[in-house]
């Protein structure tokens, strides 16, 4: 807290300019009017104040706006944004995407801070949904943003926003998140032709059900092993050897290297060894010839 002292003669700030950087903390407190500061916030960011000095300026703004800063001030906070606490940010009403971009720019290249997370939360809640422009902006600054959302939060993403998603944005998503995103992606890309559709839908396939994988197997898509390994195990298990062969195309040879890992391992255990042998890959662990497989889950459903 800076002690309140009278402003020395001739030092009263008439405008926010570079001379203020050489003011001591108490001089900033005494000689800079909070209302002047608020109206010339765009200039503050152009002056490389120390964080100690920014503390004084923040204190002045907090006194002027105890209920939270107006957006005209927020947009020009610059480095002062790094001084804000999540509690400060919860008082704000940020509606402009330009304001959001300006503040994310300050934090660019660093992990998402609690302040940024709070800011984004306030912004998205204010908009009511995660629209395409917002998603575009957020994933540009934080590629992992989408995967930091809960399935419930993801449910507010409109299908049209899915066009903004890049494959790397989904790298850290878990199956529960992909379960929510996949149907939206399917809807978003439904009017594309086969090969183009597959390119777009590929990174969302960790949420695809069996019937969609079966349909893809009829389209000569040549899915790579990395994508196959991210598929839901429960969606892969019902696929026949022939369907997997068609789905993977020339990449089917990669199954051998993955035979001990899920979902390949579990899928092998469900296939007849005879059928596996037709691949000529030496996959072992299938159901021996002559054995009858009873699907007990189906039996229970019927009784």
């Amino acid at each position: 807290e800076v002690e309140k002292t009278a402003c020395p003669s001739g030092k009263k700030a008439r405008e926010i300019d570079e001379s203020l950087i050489f003011y001591k903390k108490w001089e900033l407190e005494a000689c800079v009017d909070a209302a002047l500061l608020a109206t010339q916030m765009d200039r503050v960011n152009a002056i490389p104040f120390t964080y100690e000095q920014l503390d004084v300026l923040k204190h002045k703004l907090d006194e002027l706006y105890p209920q939270g800063y107006p957006e005209s001030v927020i947009q020009h906070l610059g480095y002062l944004f790094l001084k804000m606490s999540p509690e400060d940010i919860r008082k704000w009403n940020v509606t402009s995407l330009e304001t959001l971009k300006a503040l994310l720019e300050v934090n660019k290249g660093h992990e998402m801070s609690p302040q940024v997370a709070t800011l984004i939360d306030r912004f998205v809640k204010g908009r009511g949904q995660l629209d395409k422009d917002t998603l575009d902006t957020l994933t540009a600054f934080y590629p992992g943003y989408l995967c930091s959302l809960s399935p419930e939060e993801l449910s507010s993403v409109p299908p049209s926003s899915i066009w903004a998603v890049r494959p790397q944005d989904l790298d850290t998503c878990d199956p529960r998140q992909l379960d929510v995103l996949y149907p939206k992606a399917r809807l978003a890309f439904q009017n594309m032709n086969g090969s183009e559709y597959f390119v777009k839908i590929q990174s969302f396939l960790g949420g695809a059900p069996t019937e969609d994988l079966k349909a893809l197997s009829q389209q000569n898509v040549s899915m790579d092993l990395a994508t196959f390994m991210k598929l839901r195990t429960d969606a892969v298990l019902p696929l026949t050897v022939a369907e997997v062969q068609k789905l993977l195309g020339p990449h089917v040879e990669g199954l051998k290297a993955e035979e001990r890992h899920r979902p390949v391992r579990d899928w092998i255990l469900r296939q007849r060894q005879d059928d596996l042998d037709t691949l000529g890959l030496g996959l072992q662990g299938g159901i021996p010839n002559g054995y009858l497989v009873l699907d007990l889950s189906m039996q229970e459903a019927l009784s």
């Epitope: 120390t50 964080y51 480095y79 290249g109």
Partner: nanobody
């Protein structure tokens, strides 16, 4: 975090020159602006000069025309060239930096300049 070590201080006669250096280490890629401050015995600390990552610099009126600040990013080093030194320039000179990653100023331990 960023660590700062100043050097180059010492005893000099009025009218003489000194060149202070400040070497930064640690997360130097996050450094934005670098500053020289000074604190004379019994006085408050005051900002003497600064230089931004873009090369913009300025010095306080009290040292204008005598002190020059510069920065060598490849060596992570900040300099303060002090000419025409006066008795009132006697102080402990501190280097500090502002980073883009953490909202506190990082400080060196200071180097003493005595002008007789």
């Amino acid at each position: 975090e960023v660590q700062l070590v100043e050097s180059g201080g010492g005893l000099v006669q009025a009218g003489g020159s000194l060149r202070l250096s400040c070497v930064a280490s640690g997360r130097t890629s996050t450094i934005d602006t670098m500053y020289w401050h000074r604190q004379a015995p019994g006085n408050e600390r005051e900002l003497v000069a600064y230089v931004t990552s873009r090369g913009t610099s300025n010095v306080a009126d009290s040292v204008k025309g005598r002190f020059t600040i510069s920065r060598d990013n490849s060596k992570n080093t900040l300099y303060l060239q002090m000419n025409s030194l006066r008795a009132e320039d006697t102080a402990v000179y501190y280097c500090s930096v502002r980073t883009t990653s953490y909202p506190v100023d990082f400080w060196g331990q200071g180097t003493l300049v005595t002008v007789s």
